[in-house]
Every structure is written in structure tokens, then in C-alpha cells.
């Protein structure tokens, strides 16, 4: 009853004479242990006997013995374990057949087949390859036999167009109920290279001794491979020369389907064939240029190639560091004139006259100067010819203005108050003068550009200056405008003495001024009108009162006169010329009021007066005026008057007063 | 034709100053620098400075720094240089030279003066 | 400052000979090399300048080479009227500098 055995096998063992075969088996059985185990070759039911008969190979007994003549046969399972793997070795082709394992259990028979395949020679491994290889994408190539066995060692090697292939190869086996088999399993990364390539895998005995082989041919999927080739083979041609590209397609799986050039990485159009041909090249093509193919598994580019179209410098300019440039500023001139090859000589030129000495691309001037000003242009020069020279490039040197002087318009010479006219004038200056500046700074006419008007000048505008001025301004030397005027600041200033002025002194004025053009200069000395002398100073050995008064000096020169401020001299005297008066006569009747006045002469005025009589009696009385009321005839007598100030005093004559009886008095005697 | 004439030979004694002149002619006076070199007894050449006419620029080798004064004179068209604190080793001739229309201190020398010999002793 | 050196003080030639006077540069001064003539009591005279540009005048048979830092003046068909003093000088670098000088004697 098959549903009470379950036996576990690998099927079918191969094998090749004189190799091995190890059968991996186990058993179970569902009811009770296994008593006997017989090894048949090619089984063949008997009917009529109820039993199997053919070749006993191996026959488990109570001694467990063996049919002479199958030594080479070991069963190697055991009853406790339920293992039933057995081992031929050697194996040959007429093994092959049916193995029967005949198993009897106390109650249960079962006969279990296995397929013994056993080739002549060694049959050759299988070489398995994935569905798709790829330039680059790692793959794993498999070889694999199905045939293991403990007692025959082989080896699996791997080799590319017969030599041994460097990767490490991984081999594994299986000897299991499942599968019997040898693997060798190798990482590879196809390259182009390897398409259409052999791989082989060689079955190799213990002593290296090649037993059979698998070969498979490589199909490596890859985009194109491409040289570029160029006719005539030189990359650096002559400007009008013919050139030809040819994109050589050195391999492609699957076949290319589009071709395309690229000129400095940007296509060029209408160009999908494998030859490029350039008709009279140009300067403009020279560049990188390479072939892009296509197919299924992506595009490819070529190696580049570098086109150099050779030609003559082409028309030049110059280019300046600055212009305009400053005076005394360095400035750096480039010939530019493209050229292929770069130009070995330059030659340049200043205002069309070759500038000696220069033969470089740059040049330079350390300090510009106004006269460098003008156009440069240069010429370069190549193997193959010497370029146009371009127009040129203008230089334009800026300076302040040069050589700033001033001139007096006037006719000379120029008095005070007078109009002047000026000139700002200079030599050259670039750019041009676009204003003026005057010192000093005054409320002054420019009535044009780098003139200027001076009205009613000032006795003391002694000197101008004048700048011309466009970016920068240049200061002429200042002019001296030598203004003649009359002499300013005349006065009058006493010498002597240096305190007050008392009658008696020795007095001297001086006639100062502060200045005068011309200095010559003459003095005048008046007096109320009257002239009193023509030196600078004015002399009294003796002053007296009656000198006393207002005094000018004048100062005159060419141009004119000037006169101080009056002065008042001031003389200091003692009272003189005192007298007595009496203002209702000197004859007073009784009773009546007399009236005495003391009258002085003094400077400064008398501050302090005394009466006297006729006996030089001190009167009490201390004012101008001695009043007498009502006056008496006693009274009658002389009496005189003395006055006092901080100088000294006087006295007055004696005046005689008489004082008559009134008609009463007389009446009454 | 363009001429530069220099003064003549000067004997000098040592610690002592000497003034000598370069008088240009033939060309517009203020648009070349002018350089002088220093010649020891037909030995090589030194340079020592230049001055311009046109602004009174003056560069100088740090050689001859503080030993040479360039100073122009443009009413006559005419450079001076002066050597101060003579010694022997000052016995030279010293050559003024017309310098680069540009204005370049790195130049060749095509026009020469006349020279002038100085000798230096007691 | 660069040094510019004419190792041969003195050369002996003869009328009509090829002669080489050479110059060595201190450092690279690219072109920028002049040659002078003079002649006893005289001042130097200009031959080339830019390394080999013959100056205005000057008889072809003087002709200048080099770049960098070495250079050469050669006379070829030497003339009596060539016996003198020839010097070089550099103008790439400030202060200009000259050579010593090479002296061509008759032999």
C-alpha cells in the first residue's frame, strides 16, 4: 500500500563509467520498522511467484550480507535513522537501468524505483546564461552537472576563448534527497568586447584531466563602438582646405539605427551619415568635433577630435586701458587679431608712423604724456601672412590746463575806484577750459569767460590769482595789481607833552597816516582855515591860550589829499584876567542892591572865588558874585576878587564902589 | 640732425661737487626723457637715471641715489647732472642719452652724447 | 638687478671671419636685448635692438638672436672698421643693465 511508504530520492542518478553514484534516500514507514532491504537491478515482477526477481545488488539480512561480486555496493542507511542511501563505485554503463529497493516491514512489502543513468563517457555540465547580457551590467554565468558523488572528485573551470577566466568562481554541491548536482556559479561583467566571444565550462577530474565541456557563445548587448578617422590625417588644416571625418562603427549589438555629428557638443544638421565632409573650411569650424551613434541599447559618442583651421591674422584693433586717459597715468595698449597660430610678431603704429622697438602684443606706456594723444593701430603677423591693420583706436590724453598766466587789460596806472579788467589766459588744455576761479573771491563781473571786472577798486586789492580750470584747475601766478590812491588814515597825534597841556609847554603834533601809493606824500598843517605849516609835525616851544583850537593836518600825494578829522588842542592855564564889574555902575545909593561879579579867564573854568576889601579883609563870600543888600555907605571902599582852578590862581585889579546917602538921609540931617 | 653736446672735461677734487651739462638739439626738446650712464675706463655701462624735460620727472637707480641730481634748464634745451661728494671711484665719462619717445624706462639707447670725462683727484 | 654676462673679455678674428659674441641674461628678459658698438674715444653706437632687429643704417652683416636668457651677435665677413667694444644690455627689467663687454682684436 503506497500511501503506508513515503521514500525520498532524487529520481534519476547520472553518472559515467567508472565514476560513482551516491543515492541520497531516506523512508518512512507508517507501521512498524523496516526488517529487510533488497537492492535489485532492473527489478521485473514475477506474477506467477508473487515476487520480484533480477540481480540482487545488495541484500540487508540478519547479517546483513552482500552478493558476491557487488562489493563495489554499499548501502549506507541504517534502520534507526531511516536513511537508505547507498553508494556504487565504480559505477558502469551496464549499472544503468532501474535500482529497486525492495522494503518489507512486518506487515507491509514495498518496491521503490530509481533511474540509474550511466553514460559512457563523462556527459558535459550545462552552462545557464541569463536572458539579456549587457556591456557593464553584472551577470551570473552558471555551470552545472548533475552529478555529485563522495567518492569521485571533479572540478568545474571556467575559461573565456580557452584562457581561464580570472574572477573567483563560487562551486557548490548537493548530494539530497531533492537534487544530486556540482555548480560553479561566476560574477562577470560583459564588456563590447566579449560579444561573440566563447565561454566554456570544463568538467575536470582529480588530476586536472579535462573530462567534458559546455560551451556557450556570448551575446553581449552593447551600444556602438566608434573610431573617427580624418582624411588627409593632419587635424590642423589650412583655411579653404577640403576635410573629411569618417565615423568607423567597430561594433554594435543590436545593429546602429541613427548617426549624427556634434561640433563642439551642439549637433550640426542635416549630417546622419558615417562621413563628414567639410568643402573649404573657416575659421569657424574649428572645434571639437565627434560621431554619435545609435542602437537599441543607447547612443555612443566618439573620442573628439580637434579641428584647427589655420589662418592668416585678421583685421586688427587696439583696445586701450583708458581713454581718455590722465597725463602721467600708465596706459596699456592690445593689438587684437585673431589667428591661428597665435601671431608671432606685432608691429605698431601712431598716427600711421611705426612706433619702433614695440614688436609685442602688448603695449605699454608707462607715463602718458599729451603729445602720446592720437591713433593706434598695429599689425600682426602669423606663418601663414600678416593681418590688415585695423583703423585704429583713438587715445585721447587729458592735462590740466598749461601755462595759466593773467594780464591786466587796464592802461596802468590803476587808481583807486577805478575800473580794471582782467584776463585768465593759458597755452593749451584738454578737455577744454570750462570755467574760471578768481582769488580772492569777491562780488567781481565776469562779464565772459576767463575775464574779469573789478569796479571801484579798493585801495587794498593788492594781488589776484586766476585758475583755468576743466577737470582739473591750473593757478596762474598771482598779479599785483599796484592800486594807486590817496593816503587813508591821516589824523592827528600829539607827541609832547605826554599828559595835559598847560600853558607854557613845548607842544608837538604829528600828521600820521596808515598808507599811501605813491608813499611820496606832502604835509599841510591849518589852523581855522589858516595854514600853518607844510612838516609832518606841528611845533610850540611856548603854548599859549590863544592857541587854543581846532587843527587838521592834511596829507596829499599824486592822486590826491586826504585830511584828518579836526583836532582840538586844549591849552590849560591858571584864571588871568580878572576883573571886577559891577552891572548898575560903581556909584549906589544906600539901600539900594550892589551887585559885584567876579570875571576870570581860566581853563579849565575857575572853581573856587574870594572877595576882598580894600584892607585885603577876606569877605565871606566864595561866589562869583559878591551881593551887597541893602548896601550901606560904609560900604563904600575898594574890593578886588580871586579865582581858583586845578592850574593855579588870579587876582583882579581893585574896583572902588561908592555908595551915596539916598535923598532921605540927607533930607533927614 | 638730432645732437647731443656735452660739456667738456672736468678735473675735481675728491669731497668736492661737479655740474655737468647735456645740450639736445635737432628735435623738440620736451617730448624725450634724457638718460645718463656711467662708463669706467672703457668698462661697461652703468645707468643712473633720466629726467624729463616736459615736467621735470625725474627716476634714479638706487645705485647713484643721493650721489646724482638731474635738474633742466628749457629756455636752453639743455639737462645738468650733478655729482656730489667726489671720490676716485666717480672718475668716469658720463654719457647723456636720448631716451623713448613713449616715455618707457625699459628701452635701447640710439641717440649719445658727447660724453664728458671726470677725474677725481687731490 | 639683472646681471648680463659676456664671458669672452677679448676675441681674436680676422678680416673676413664669422664671429659670435654671446650674452648670458641673469634671468628670462624675453627679447628685450640691445647691442652697442664703440670705438676708443667714442660713444657706443646702436646695432639691435628686440633681441634682432638690426637698428637704422647698421650693415646687414651684424645680426642679433636669442630670447629668454641667451643671445648672440654675430658678424659674419668681419671688416676692420668692426674692431671695437660690443655690449649688450637688457631693458625687460628695471634699472637697465649691461654687459661687461667683448673687445674683438686682430689675431
Known amino acids: 500500500d503506497s500511501s503506508k511508504w513515503n521514500i525520498e530520492h532524487p529520481g534519476t542518478i547520472y553518472a559515467w563509467e567508472g565514476a560513482c553514484v551516491w543515492v541520497p534516500c531516506t523512508y518512512r514507514v507508517l507501521d512498524g520498522a523496516l526488517e529487510t532491504f533488497i537492492l535489485f537491478h532492473n527489478p521485473e515482477y514475477n506474477q506467477n511467484m508473487s515476487k520480484f526477481e533480477g540481480t540482487r545488488l545488495y541484500e540487508s539480512t540478519k547479517d546483513g550480507k552482500v552478493p558476491s561480486g557487488q562489493k563495489r555496493v554499499q548501502f549506507l542507511g541504517n534502520k534507526i535513522n531511516n536513511n537508505c542511501t547507498l553508494s556504487i563505485h565504480p559505477v558502469h554503463v551496464n549499472d544503468s537501468g532501474q535500482l529497486g529497493l525492495r522494503m518489507v516491514s512486518k506487515t507491509e512489502k514495498w518496491m521503490e524505483r530509481i533511474h540509474l543513468n550511466v553514460s559512457e563517457r563523462p556527459f558535459p555540465p550545462r552552462i545557464q546564461l541569463p536572458p539579456k547580457l549587457q556591456e557593464s551590467q553584472e551577470v551570473t554565468l552558471t555551470c552545472l552537472l548533475n552529478f555529485s558523488c563522495y567518492g569521485y572528485q571533479i572540478q568545474l573551470q571556467w575559461l573565456l576563448e580557452g584562457v581561464p577566466m580570472r574572477q573567483a568562481a563560487v562551486t557548490s554541491t548537493s548530494l539530497s534527497t531533492k537534487s544530486v548536482f556540482t555548480r560553479s556559479e561566476l560574477k562577470f561583467s560583459p564588456q563590447w568586447s566579449h560579444h561573440g566571444k566563447i565561454v566554456t565550462c570544463e568538467l575536470h577530474d582529480v588530476d586536472g584531466k579535462v573530462l567534458s565541456e559546455d560551451m556557450v557563445q556570448l551575446n553581449v548587448k552593447h551600444t556602438p563602438k566608434l573610431t573617427i578617422e580624418v582624411t588627409p590625417n593632419e587635424t590642423i588644416v589650412r583655411k579653404g582646405d577640403s576635410v573629411t571625418m569618417t565615423c568607423k562603427v567597430n561594433s554594435s549589438n543590436p545593429e546602429y539605427t541613427t548617426v549624427s555629428w556634434l561640433k563642439d557638443g551642439i549637433p550640426l544638421k542635416e549630417q546622419n551619415t558615417l562621413m563628414l565632409t567639410l568643402h573649404e573650411v573657416t575659421k569657424s569650424q574649428t572645434g571639437r568635433y565627434c560621431c554619435r551613434v545609435s542602437n537599441d541599447v543607447g547612443p555612443a559618442t566618439s573620442e573628439k577630435v580637434f579641428l584647427q583651421v589655420q589662418y592668416a591674422p585678421e583685421p586688427s584693433r587696439v583696445q586701450i586701458s583708458q581713454s581718455p586717459a590722465v597725463e602721467g597715468s600708465e596706459v596699456n595698449f592690445l593689438c587684437i587679431s585673431p589667428a591661428n597660430p597665435l601671431p608671432t610678431n606685432y608691429t605698431w603704429y601712431h598716427n600711421g608712423k611705426e612706433v619702433q622697438g614695440r614688436t609685442e602684443k602688448q603695449f605699454q606706456i608707462q607715463k602718458i604724456l599729451p603729445w602720446h594723444a592720437g591713433t593706434y593701430s598695429c599689425e600682426a603677423e602669423n606663418i601663414l601672412g600678416i593681418g590688415e591693420r585695423g583703423p585704429g583706436t583713438e587715445l585721447d590724453v587729458q592735462y590740466p590746463p598749461k601755462k595759466v598766466t593773467m594780464v591786466i587789460e587796464n592802461p596802468t596806472p590803476i587808481r583807486e575806484g577805478d575800473t580794471v579788467t582782467l584776463s585768465c589766459n593759458y597755452s593749451s588744455s584738454n578737455p577744454i577750459v570750462n570755467h574760471y576761479e578768481w582769488r580772492p573771491r569777491g562780488a567781481w563781473e565776469e562779464p565772459s569767460l576767463g575775464v574779469l571786472k573789478i569796479q571801484n577798486i579798493g585801495w587794498n586789492n593788492t594781488a589776484v590769482a586766476c585758475a583755468a580750470c576743466n577737470n582739473w584747475c591750473s593757478w596762474a601766478s598771482p598779479v599785483t595789481l599796484n592800486v594807486l590812491y590817496a593816503p587813508r588814515g591821516v589824523r592827528v597825534r600829539k607827541i609832547k607833552p605826554l599828559s595835559e597841556i598847560h600853558s607854557g609847554n613845548s607842544v608837538s603834533l604829528q600828521c600820521d597816516f596808515s598808507s599811501s601809493h605813491p608813499k611820496e606824500v606832502q604835509f599841510f598843517w591849518e589852523k581855522n582855515g589858516s595854514l600853518l605849516g607844510k612838516e609832518s609835525q606841528l611845533n610850540f616851544d611856548s603854548i599859549s591860550p590863544e592857541d587854543a583850537g581846532s587843527y587838521s593836518c592834511w596829507v596829499n600825494n599824486s592822486i590826491g589829499q586826504t585830511a584828518s578829522k579836526a583836532w582840538t588842542l586844549e591849552v590849560l592855564y591858571a584864571p588871568r584876567r580878572l576883573r571886577v564889574s559891577m552891572s548898575q555902575g560903581n556909584q549906589v545909593m544906600e539901600g539900594k542892591t550892589a551887585t559885584l561879579t567876579c570875571e576870570s579867564d581860566a581853563n579849565p573854568p575857575v572853581y573856587s572865588y574870594a572877595w576882598f576889601d580894600w584892607n585885603n579883609q577876606s569877605l565871606p563870600y566864595s561866589g562869583r558874585m559878591l551881593r551887597l543888600e541893602p548896601v550901606k555907605v560904609q560900604h563904600s571902599g575898594a574890593y578886588w576878587c580871586q579865582g581858583t582852578n586845578r592850574v593855579g590862581k588870579g587876582h583882579s585889579p581893585l574896583i572902588t564902589l561908592t555908595v551915596y546917602y539916598s535923598p532921605q538921609t540927607i533930607g533927614r540931617r | 640732425q638730432v645732437q647731443l653736446q656735452q660739456s667738456g672735461a672736468e678735473q675735481v677734487k675728491p669731497g668736492a661737487s661737479v655740474k655737468m651739462s647735456c645740450k639736445a638739439s635737432?628735435?623738440?626738446?620736451?617730448?624725450?626723457?634724457i638718460e645718463w650712464m656711467k662708463q669706467n675706463h672703457g668698462e661697461s655701462l652703468d645707468w643712473i637715471g633720466n629726467?624729463?624735460?616736459?615736467?621735470?620727472?625725474?627716476e634714479y637707480n638706487e645705485k647713484f641715489k643721493g650721489k646724482a641730481t638731474l635738474t633742466v634748464e628749457k629756455s636752453s634745451n639743455t639737462v645738468f647732472l650733478e655729482l656730489s661728494r667726489l671720490t676716485s671711484d666717480d672718475s668716469a665719462v658720463y654719457y647723456c642719452?636720448?631716451?623713448?619717445?613713449?616715455?618707457?624706462?625699459?628701452?635701447?639707447?640710439?641717440?649719445w652724447g658727447t660724453g664728458t670725462t671726470v677725474t677725481v683727484s687731490s | 638687478d639683472i646681471v648680463m654676462t659676456q664671458s669672452q673679455k677679448f676675441m681674436s678674428t680676422t678680416v673676413g671671419d664669422r664671429v659670435s659674441i654671446t650674452c648670458k641674461a641673469g634671468?628670462?628678459?624675453?627679447?628685450?636685448v640691445a647691442w652697442y658698438q664703440q670705438k676708443p674715444g667714442q660713444s657706443p653706437k646702436l646695432l639691435i635692438y628686440?633681441?634682432?632687429t638690426r637698428y637704422i643704417g647698421v650693415p646687414e652683416r651684424f645680426t642679433g638672436s636669442g630670447s629668454g636668457t641667451d643671445f648672440t651677435l654675430t658678424i659674419t665677413n668681419m671688416q676692420s672698421e668692426d674692431l671695437a667694444d660690443y655690449f649688450c644690455q637688457q631693458y625687460s627689467s628695471f634699472p637697465l643693465t649691461f654687459g661687461t663687454g667683448t673687445k674683438l682684436e686682430l689675431k
Open positions: 635737432g628735435y623738440t626738446f620736451t617730448t624725450y626723457p
Open positions: 629726467i624729463h624735460p616736459y615736467n621735470d620727472d625725474t
Open positions: 642719452v636720448r631716451g623713448d619717445y613713449y616715455n618707457s624706462r625699459y628701452w635701447y639707447f640710439d641717440v
Open positions: 634671468q628670462n628678459v624675453r627679447t628685450a
Open positions: 628686440s633681441a634682432s
